[in-house]
């Protein structure tokens, strides 16, 4: 159940997809990836206020218990709900291969 | 790929399963759940230092970019990797029903 998409903290402050430009060096991939030299990394960033994009019942529980025990129970966290696949040209023992990764780039986000 | 399970921050400080005792009132369920009166809620709590229980490639990317841009990119977050089902006796218009929920209790945890 995806709950409310209205962010009470103001536009862009709540859990959503962001794009961060990163080089192979930034990612620590320079020794095993040849291409791309730069990646537009999509990731989930932002606050998860009460019931905002709650992924499931567990997220709703977490919200309730965080309100009661903020020092013990953390608020729900903004994480990928699904991913977009991506290919990398990577070095192998004998040369290069084109490899698909299904869990690299966030496609959309929710709170859990 | 589940990466290292050794916590560099000390025993019990990193992402792991915790149990939090909660009443129906705590959970905001008192008006629609009859039983149980109290739930042993299992949830994922703790820090996600570099490569600790990294859920996938995305988590590894997040770790690298958090190290580079800590103000922009948050560290990976401790969330459920899977769930244990739970039944609730809940009120209905005509009486009660026994309902199974698959996404209520965390079974194990990873960082993402």
């Amino acid at each position: 159940a995806r709950n409310g998409d209205h962010c009470p903290l103001g536009p862009g402050r709540c859990c959503r997809l962001h794009t961060v430009r990163a080089s192979l060096e930034d990612l620590g991939w320079a020794d095993w990836v040849l291409s791309p030299r730069e990646v537009q990394v999509t990731m989930c960033i932002g606050a998860c206020p009460s019931q905002f994009r709650a992924a499931n019942m567990h997220a709703q529980i977490k919200t309730s218990l965080h309100r009661l025990k903020p020092d013990t129970v953390p608020a729900p966290c903004c994480v990928p709900a699904s991913y977009n696949p991506m290919v990398l040209i990577q070095k192998t023992d004998t040369g290069v291969s084109l490899q698909t990764y299904d869990d690299l780039l966030a496609k959309d986000c929710h709170c859990i | 790929a589940r990466n290292g399970d050794h916590c560099p921050l000390g025993p019990g400080r990193c992402c792991r399963l915790h149990t939090v005792r909660a009443s129906l009132e705590d959970l905001g369920w008192a008006d629609w759940v009859l039983s149980p009166r109290e739930v042993q809620v299992t949830m994922c709590i703790g820090a996600c230092p570099s490569q600790f229980r990294a859920a996938n490639m995305h988590a590894q990317i997040k770790t690298s970019l958090h190290r580079l841009k800590p103000d922009t990119v948050p560290a990976p977050c401790c969330v459920p990797a899977s769930y244990n089902p739970m039944v609730l006796i809940q009120k209905t218009d005509t009486g009660v029903s026994l309902q199974t929920y698959d996404d209520l209790l965390a079974k194990d945890c990873h960082c993402i």
């Epitope: 696949p85 290919v87 040209i89 290069v96 084109l98 698909t100 780039l105 | -």
Partner: antibody
């Protein structure tokens, strides 16, 4: 496994528009880094790159042919189309489509032969 | 556009011999040169990426080297199935361009 199949009219009259379709399987054009390119080869001659289209809909064209070329994709149908307008006998060739991963063209179709003649 | 010039146009050799093909770019393309093999009636087969990296499944008798403007493709010991046309291609910048091809034929 990855396969690509070109289809076209076989015979086109001068000044008309040549329409080609590349139908593929084994990969998705919604995957970051993936593209489909078109290359042609006149009879007994070498290879000439024509155009390519990327997962994000960015398009690139052969400089000399740019004004005559159109490329488009239908991600849900796993198809890429190429149109070449105002054809002449010089456009007679075997037309290939190829799967691209960044700057690698690793899988090619078998090609479709196109003759421009009245 | 970057012009790729291959030499020789034709090369006659015998099985077991070493074969070397040259490719020159009209401007610096770093190491961004690929090599393809094409047999009669077939589509091109991708062999070498970025001057020297063999693609998955390509036998190690095929190799490439070079950077800047001068590139070399080598077959260390030609097999009967290697008689074909070989093309270099720059992937440094679009428009991508191919060399004119080198036909490796049986002497």
């Amino acid at each position: 496994q990855v396969t690509l199949q070109e289809s076209g009219p076989g015979l086109v009259k001068p000044s008309e528009t040549l329409s080609l379709t590349c139908s593929f399987s084994g990969f998705s054009l919604s995957t970051y880094g993936i593209g489909v390119g078109w290359i042609r080869q006149p009879p007994g001659k070498g290879l000439e790159w024509l155009a390519h289209i990327w997962w994000n809909n960015n398009k690139y064209f052969n400089t000399a042919l740019k004004s005559r070329l159109t490329i488009s994709k239908d991600t849900s149908k796993n198809q890429v189309s190429l149109k070449l307008s105002s054809v002449t006998a010089a456009d007679t060739a075997t037309y290939y489509c190829a799967r691209m991963g960044y700057d690698i063209m690793d899988y090619w179709g078998q090609g479709t032969s196109v003759t421009v003649s009245s | 556009d970057i012009v790729m010039t291959q030499s020789p146009a034709t090369l006659s050799t015998s099985p077991g011999e070493r074969v070397t093909i040259s490719c020159k770019a009209s401007q610096d393309v770093n190491t961004a040169v690929a090599w393809y093999q094409q047999k009669p009636g077939q589509s091109p087969r991708f062999l070498i990426y970025s001057s020297s990296y063999r693609y998955t499944g390509v036998p190690d008798r095929f190799s490439g080297s070079g950077s800047g403007t001068d590139f070399t493709f080598t077959i260390s010991s030609v097999q009967s199935e290697d008689f074909a046309v070989y093309y270099c291609q720059q992937h440094y910048s679009t428009p991508w361009t191919f060399g004119g091809g080198t036909k490796v034929e049986i002497k």
